[in-house]
Interface confidence: low
């Protein structure tokens, strides 16, 4: 239907800032009725383009801990198992919105951030350079 | 590391839910010097896993626009250009954090939610089951 | 290309009845909620009337309450202006425009896509 | 008469900041975010600005806007010839229950 006018039991904002300051409940609500395939898939290993997960820490953070895909080889796993470097394990990249603690160290003040994460990888075709 | 004292500047917080709701401040820092990869690049048309960027909107989230990676195949692209259906396009899934307007329809008072989205596409070897 | 071509404009008597379309093509017109908005000579923009994405809810200014009907064929991608009793002040550019969300939503998104528009003139 | 004030009119000089306001009222600004709509003279008006300062793919990041309270502005930081136009912020006002353009503001590059 039509966009509801605003919900009378909004909070007021008497913030200058308004709306660039906002209150968030960090009680996460999960809209995945399923556990997160990333961890429960073993796509990593399987992959032509396998990867390793490392674990990036920052208490400072909102969610505090984060899983960097990093792509184990230049090249990608042909057939034979072997790793052909005609091909390329390329990172696949995503910004993801995080919350920064601002002031350094308050509990209940954060900036929303934008970071850079590799979810995984994938083969891609390299381009090539031709010298004339 | 150690867990650093409170800063003494932080915002006090008398609400009754604290820490569960805080503030948040909109103004997104970008920690990423460069463009967003996953724009810039054209892994989604070179993998051996290619795979469509599709617009998924919703004003009721911040942020508003997510992009969301459909295979274009069930098979991998092989050396000749053609669909190899021995082997699997998957995609690669991330939890995300995006903020929900609660109350609807309010502009200053989110939840934070976690939502799956699909990042890009990656080809693995299809698990085979064996029947006796 | 996204694209919205409104037809039916013209010169018409004051208490007299037209009809005025627009053409959708270059995305999935029933997924978007749609306005139209006019602009009177030497004025600024006036809303007139928003249409949900299915037809279900309809919006209208006051100043055109109960004389325009808003409507939408979303089997010929087509929003309609059906506007009855035209008045002088009615004289105005008439565009349609699409909501920047899919959905239920008719404002977080602004309308990102307009067409050219369409002249009304009512007048004896 | 508009639900949304805007001042008749604005200008600078190239490169030069100009500010722009445009104030309602617990209905409709109070309630609801901002978008922005520029208008070149004989052309059909161009989405500049919408939800939390969030700006379509093409329009310059010379452009921003703030909100607070009852009012908005938009700023144009950089003024160049090509920002000559008509500005007009619109929202959604409740107690019309629809949707409301500001009176308009427009921008002389000097």
């Known amino acids: 239907g039509i966009t509801i006018p605003r919900n009378p039991g909004c909070p007021n904002s008497e913030d200058k800032n308004f709306p660039r300051t906002v209150m968030v409940n960090l009680n996460i609500h999960n809209r995945n009725t399923n556990t997160n395939p990333k961890r429960s898939s073993d796509y990593y290993n399987r992959s032509t383009s396998p990867w390793n997960l490392h674990r990036n820490e920052d208490p400072e953070r909102y969610p505090s801990v984060i899983w960097e895909a990093k792509c184990r080889h230049l090249g990608c796993i042909n057939a034979d198992g072997n790793v052909d470097y005609h091909m390329n394990s390329v990172p696949i990249q995503q910004e993801i919105l995080v919350l920064r603690r601002e002031p350094p160290h308050c509990p209940n003040s954060f900036r929303l951030e934008k970071i850079l994460v590799s979810v995984g990888c994938t083969c891609v075709t390299p381009i090539v350079h031709h010298v004339a | 590391g150690i867990t650093i004292p409170r800063n003494p500047g932080c915002p006090n917080s008398e609400d009754k839910n604290f820490p569960r709701t805080v503030m948040v401040n909109l103004n997104i820092h970008n920690r990423n010097t460069n463009t967003n990869p996953k724009r810039s690049s054209d892994y989604y048309n070179r993998s051996t896993s290619p795979w469509n960027l599709h617009r998924n909107e919703d004003p009721e989230r911040y942020p508003s626009v997510i992009w969301e990676a459909k295979c274009r195949h069930l098979g991998c692209i092989n050396a000749d250009g053609n669909v190899d259906y021995h082997m699997n396009s998957v995609p690669i899934q991330q939890e995300i954090l995006v903020l929900r307007r609660e109350p609807p329809h309010c502009p200053n008072s989110f939840r934070l939610e976690k939502i799956l989205v699909s990042v890009g596409c990656t080809c693995v070897t299809p698990i085979v089951h064996h029947v006796a | 290309e996204v694209q919205l071509l409104e037809s039916g404009g013209g010169v018409v008597q004051p208490g007299r009845s037209l009809r005025l379309s627009c053409a959708a093509s270059g995305f999935i017109f029933s997924n978007y909620g749609m306005h139209w908005v006019r602009q009177a000579p030497g004025k600024g923009l006036e809303w007139v009337a928003v249409i949900s994405y299915d037809g279900s809810n309809k919006y209208y200014a006051d100043s055109v309450k109960g004389r325009f009907t808003i409507s939408r064929d979303n089997s010929k991608n087509t929003l309609y202006l059906e506007m009855n009793s035209l008045r002088p002040e009615d004289t105005a550019v008439y565009y349609c425009?699409?909501?920047?969300?899919?959905?239920?939503?008719?404002?977080?998104?602004?309308?990102?896509?307009w067409g050219q528009g369409t002249t009304v003139t009512v007048s004896s | 008469q508009s639900g949304l004030t805007q001042p008749p009119s604005a200008s600078g000089t190239p490169g030069q900041t100009v500010s722009i306001s445009c104030s309602g009222s617990?209905?409709?600004?109070?309630?609801?975010?901002v978008n922005w709509y520029q208008q070149v003279p004989g052309a059909a008006p161009k989405l500049l600005m919408y939800g939390i300062g969030q700006r379509p793919s093409g329009v310059p990041d010379r452009f921003s806007v703030s909100q607070s309270g009852t009012s908005a502005s938009l700023a144009i930081s950089g003024l160049q010839s090509e920002d000559e136009a008509d500005y007009y912020c619109a929202t959604w006002d409740d107690s019309l229950g629809g949707y409301v353009f500001g009176s308009g503001t427009k921008v002389t590059v000097l």
């Open positions: 425009a699409k909501v920047g969300a899919s959905g239920d939503y008719y404002y977080s998104y602004g309308l990102d896509v």
């Open positions: 617990n209905s409709n600004i109070g309630s609801h975010s």
